[in-house]
Every structure is written in C-alpha cells, then in structure tokens.
C-alpha cells in the first residue's frame, strides 16, 4: 500500500437545510482508472463509514440509492455533498481516497473537515 496526499477544507458549516459540501483533492501519483472515495465520520471514540463510491476516471460518482452523499468528480478533485444533516451529526468528516486500478494500490486519508450543523430554530407562531 502506497501513501498519497489528500487535501480537504478544515471547516464547513452546513446550510440551514442540513446540507454540507466540500472538495476532496488527491495528488494522484499515476494514471488511475478506478478510484474509490469514502467519507468517514469521527466523533469522540466513534468512527463510522458514512458513504462510499467507486468511479471510473471521467465518469460520475455513483453512491448507493439510499446514501446521504452525492458527488461529482473533475480530474483529481471530488466535490462531495452530504445531506440530511442534523446538529447531532456535527463531527469530523474524513475523506479517504483509494486508487484501486491499475496497480499499485494507493491510499490517501485527509485530515478531515469539521462539519458544524445547527438545527434551525422553529418559526415562532405569529398572529396576523
């Protein structure tokens, strides 16, 4: 397994609709044709696998139908969007990139993007 550099923003604030987007950029050492991107979440001692997609270079990322993630790729950049976030989902979201084919296998893990999610305040009842 060979190491690869992965860059991602340090902090992102989710929108009031619970959507957060960030770019994950990797320094590809070769001409990979098959790339796997995984988003992991770390909060205290819990590390969970949020979503993953494998794509062929030049093609779209395909996440599972029920995934909370969507994304697009452009060269060595992956634009990731996570939706349906609530305040309890605040945490460090780590971008992990694997160059699956052709060999050799490369693995890169970003330092993580701290995503802050603030639940919107309910609208106060108003009398007209």
């Amino acid at each position: 397994c060979k190491a690869m550099h992965v860059a991602q923003p340090a902090v992102v604030l989710a929108s009031s609709r619970g959507i957060a987007s960030f770019v994950c950029e990797y320094a590809s050492p070769g001409k990979a044709t098959e790339v796997r991107v995984t988003v992991l979440r770390q909060a205290d001692s819990q590390v969970t696998e949020v979503c993953a997609a494998t794509y062929m270079m030049g093609n779209e990322l395909t996440f599972l139908d029920d995934s909370i993630c969507t994304g697009t790729s452009s060269g060595n950049q992956v634009n990731l969007t996570i939706q349906g976030l609530r305040a309890m989902d605040t945490g460090l979201y780590i971008c992990k990139v694997e160059l699956m084919y052709p060999p050799p296998y490369y693995l890169g893990i970003g330092n993580g993007t701290q995503i802050y999610v603030i639940d919107p305040e309910p609208c106060p009842d108003s009398d007209f």
Epitope: T38, Q42, D44, S45, Q46, T48, E49, C51, L107, I109
Partner: antibody
Framework: EVQLQQSGAEVKKPGASVKVSCKAS????????MDWVRQAPGASLDWIGN????????SYNQKFKGKATLTVDKSTSTAYMELRSLTAGDIAVYYC?????????????WGQGTLVTVSS | QIVLTQTPLSLSVSPGEPASISCSAS?????MHWFQQKPGQSPKSWIY???ILASGVPDRFSGSGSGTDFTLKISRVEADDAGVYYC?????????FGTGTKLELK
C-alpha cells in the same frame, strides 16, 4: 511491531468484579482507539465498546452499559475493562483490539484474549 | 442495531473446490469487513472495506457486495482455510458481527 498483551485468565465468584488489562506496545498508545470484544463459548463476536485513549471518551454497546467500564492508563499504555456483578452469562473470552491504519483496516490487531470464568 | 446474518452456518468443501459465504445486513451498510478465526486463537482481519485483502491473505480469497448483500469467496480451498469466518459492519453503532460460518475440509 504492534502488540496487545492481555492479562491472564480469571476465575471469579458470582456477583464479583474483574478487571482485564491490555498493555499496548509498538505504537503511540494515544493515536488509536481501543475496542473490546466478547466471545462466549461457541458463540459469535460481540462488540462491547471502545475508548479513545487521548480524550478518554468512551462509546458502549447498550447491551454492556452498566456491565463494562473502559478506562486507560496513558503512563503505562494500558487499557482496562472492568466487568461488575458477574454471572454465568459473563463467561467468555474477552479481547482488546486496535485498528490497522487510522481510518483503515479495522480491528487489524488483537490481544490473545482473556478467559473469564464465573463459578461458585 | 444492524443485524448481520451469515449463510451457510457451516460448509464442508473438498480441497481445490470453490467456496462462498454470504453476509446479509438488516439495513444498508457502506462496507463489510471479514475476519477468520481458528480454534483457540484470536480473530484475524481477513478482508476489509468489502474487497481489500489484509496483509498475508492469499489472493484465492475475494470479497464483494454492496448495500445489504456481501460475499466472501475462495476460488480454490486449501487445508489452511479451515476456520470460522465472521463479517462485521462499521456503518453504525453499535458495531456488529455476523453469526459466523464454519468452513471445514472434506
């Protein structure tokens, strides 16, 4: 070389407590979570919980809340799991385990296991 | 919690023959991880992130699947492959393991 050395087998009476240790070596102890897994005789594996040695924050399987308590001693790079109010249902081999790389190769390293027997 | 059900519970295979173990999740998971355990030994990481072989695992083994259905395959079983195989998920807490599949050689 990463090594997780667990304490020896224990025989306890019902209602007693036991503290199992897991001494880590070959890496920076505070860099990785330590997880604990139970295996009752002839049964599958059951995740008990984990501890972040750096922050000492813990996460437990609801099934083991009130039964297991996870702690660490950073000065000796040792993780501990205490089981209280032991019953025959707690008879099992208990393992400590650690991930391979950070965020990759989950549970790549395992201790040799500690057999806890409960008998009057 | 996510329940992982493995099939078959046990299988007996002749050396050189293929073998397949399935792991079905009660709800969708991102990846499946597999462990091998021999009698009296600690489990060993065998396949992680669905398809990546752990260090030292022969390439006769492969892992595949997505969503709720995952498979561990052995192209040609050898004597040393005997043991119990467990699947595990890390998509949501509590982390859970499969029921286990015992592989024996004929």
């Amino acid at each position: 070389e990463v090594q997780l050395q667990q304490s020896g087998a224990e025989v306890k009476k019902p209602g007693a407590s036991v503290k199992v240790s897991c001494k880590a070596s070959g890496y920076t102890f505070t860099d990785y979570n330590m997880d604990w897994v139970r295996q009752a005789p002839g049964a599958s594996l059951d995740w008990i919980g984990n501890i972040n040695p750096n922050s000492e924050s813990t996460s437990y399987n609801q099934k083991f809340k009130g039964k297991a308590t996870l702690t660490v001693d950073k000065s000796t790079s040792t993780a501990y799991m205490e089981l209280r109010s032991l019953t025959a249902g707690d008879i099992a081999v208990y393992y400590c385990t650690r991930d391979g790389n950070r965020y990759d190769a989950w549970f790549a390293y395992w201790g040799q296991g500690t057999l806890v027997t409960v008998s009057s | 919690q996510i329940v992982l059900t493995q099939t078959p519970l046990s299988l007996s295979v002749s050396p050189g023959e293929p073998a397949s173990i399935s792991c079905s999740a009660s709800s969708s998971v991102t990846y499946m991880h597999w462990f091998q355990q021999k009698p009296g030994q600690s489990p060993k990481s065998w396949i992680y992130s669905t398809s990546i072989l752990a260090s030292g695992v022969p390439d006769r083994f492969s892992g595949s699947g997505s969503g709720t259905d995952f498979t561990l395959k052995i192209s040609r079983v050898e004597a040393d492959d005997a043991g119990v195989y467990y699947c595990q998920q890390r998509t949501s807490y509590p982390l859970t393991f499969g029921t286990g599949t015992k592989l024996e050689l004929k």
